[in-house]
Interface confidence: low
């Protein structure tokens, strides 16, 4: 499998799709799970509703959630209020009894909000801080920076 | 389908102003940041500014700082990108791009550009 | 400002050969803030590669990206007569995003 990778911005919502055959996989459950070191196990974040038929419903672990369109074959991730904490290697999985076939490995990274400034001028960017203000978003890439909120550093 | 379509082409002065626009369409408008980039006749391209059309917030490259203005009408799902106090150096084709989820300070959707002669 | 360049300038081939251009940036950008983009005359840019390496949808799998830091390379394997165009690679890492002034490949 190669790995795609999904960059989204800090303190917002990022969606990964993951595409599969959805005749192949009819009547199995999917899965998130994140990868514990290159080698090591994958670790279930989030997995869909226990009756398959139900997929469609959205659940929730913590800022997590995933559905799935099992007549598309589209597996939805959505990972809210993303942080730095988030970047990482994760899998999309299709469950059948105690195995997990993999439909696609994808790599997050974090990145910066680039309207997350006072100064209309700068820009804010990976490698200038550690630090990240939480915010709370419902939707990928559609919000700035909140009223009140402490603002990134400025590009140097 | 998802596509970007901007205005018709345009003359201006030196020291006039020029708003372009980019309408919106096959997608959620509010949640996908617009970015406007140009290209000089036979040059490369110049990235300009951002907009996330969800707020109007907006962020400039400091070159164009105090010269361009991004604006949005969520109504119409178009963008707006005015320059103003036009130079002859200014003539480009101007493009509205979107960026896409997977990698938001990237291009994947572009109008099909908008040429801005300015020319006295 | 990262400045950007590109070499060469112009690459002549063949259908069917194998392209390489570089990109070097003037400063790191780390690994994942690099993207390719393909302009054909009168058109508008399309994009190819973003993250070094990871495929905008839709791109076919000659055209591949690697490198880090301050050196990127686009390969496309095998030049099919539609990929005779210019090549773009933009930064975006540090404000402002920038590009490189592009390579032209062109039929030898």
């Known amino acids: 499998h190669n790995t795609t990778v999904f960059q989204g911005v800090a303190g917002q919502s990022l969606q990964v799709s993951c595409p599969y055959d959805s005749m192949k996989h009819w009547g199995r459950r999917k899965a998130w799970c994140r990868q514990l070191g290159e080698k090591g196990p994958c670790q279930r974040v989030v997995s869909t509703h226990n009756l398959w038929l139900l997929s469609f419903l959205r659940r929730w672990n913590g800022s997590t959630a995933i559905t799935d369109d099992t007549l598309g074959g589209t597996l939805t991730i959505t990972l809210r209020n993303l942080q730095p904490h988030d970047a990482g290697l994760y899998q999309c999985q299709s469950l059948h009894g105690s195995e997990a076939d993999t439909l696609r490995k994808v790599l997050v990274e974090v990145l910066a909000d680039p309207l997350d400034h006072r100064d209309a001028g700068d820009l804010w960017f990976p490698g200038e801080s550690e630090s990240f203000e939480d915010a709370h978003v419902e939707h990928s890439i559609s919000r700035s920076l909140l009223e009140g909120e402490i603002p990134f550093p400025p590009t140097s | 389908q998802v596509q970007l379509v901007q205005s018709g082409a345009e003359v201006k002065k030196p020291g006039a102003s020029v708003k372009v626009s980019c309408k919106a369409s096959?997608?959620?408008?509010?949640?996908?940041?617009i970015h406007w980039v140009r290209q000089a006749p036979g040059q490369g391209l110049e990235w300009m500014g951002i907009i996330n059309p969800s707020g109007g917030s907006t962020s400039y490259a400091q070159k164009f700082q105090g010269r361009v203005t991004m604006t949005r009408d969520t109504s119409t799902s178009t963008v707006y990108m005015e320059l103003s106090s036009l130079r002859s150096e200014d003539t480009a084709v101007y493009y509205c791009?979107?960026?896409?989820?997977?990698?938001?300070?990237?291009?994947?959707?572009w109008g099909q550009g908008t040429m801005v002669t300015v020319s006295s | 400002e990262i400045v950007m360049t590109q070499s060469p300038g112009t690459l002549s081939l063949s259908p069917g050969e194998r392209a390489t251009l570089s990109c070097r940036a003037s400063q790191s950008v780390s690994s994942s803030y690099l993207a390719w983009y393909q302009q054909k005359p009168g058109q508008a840019p399309r994009l190819l590669i973003y993250?070094?390496?990871s495929r905008a949808t839709g791109i076919p799998d000659r055209f591949s990206g690697s490198g880090s830091g301050t050196d990127f390379t686009l390969t496309i394997s095998r030049l099919e007569p539609e990929d005779f165009a210019v090549y773009y690679c933009?930064?975006?890492?540090?404000?402002?995003?920038?590009f490189g002034g592009g390579t032209k490949v062109e039929i030898k």
């Open positions: 933009q930064q975006y890492f540090s404000s402002p995003f920038t």
């Open positions: 096959g997608y959620t408008f509010t949640s996908y940041y």
């Open positions: 791009a979107r960026a896409p989820q997977e990698s938001p300070y990237v291009f994947d959707i």
């Open positions: 993250g070094a390496s």
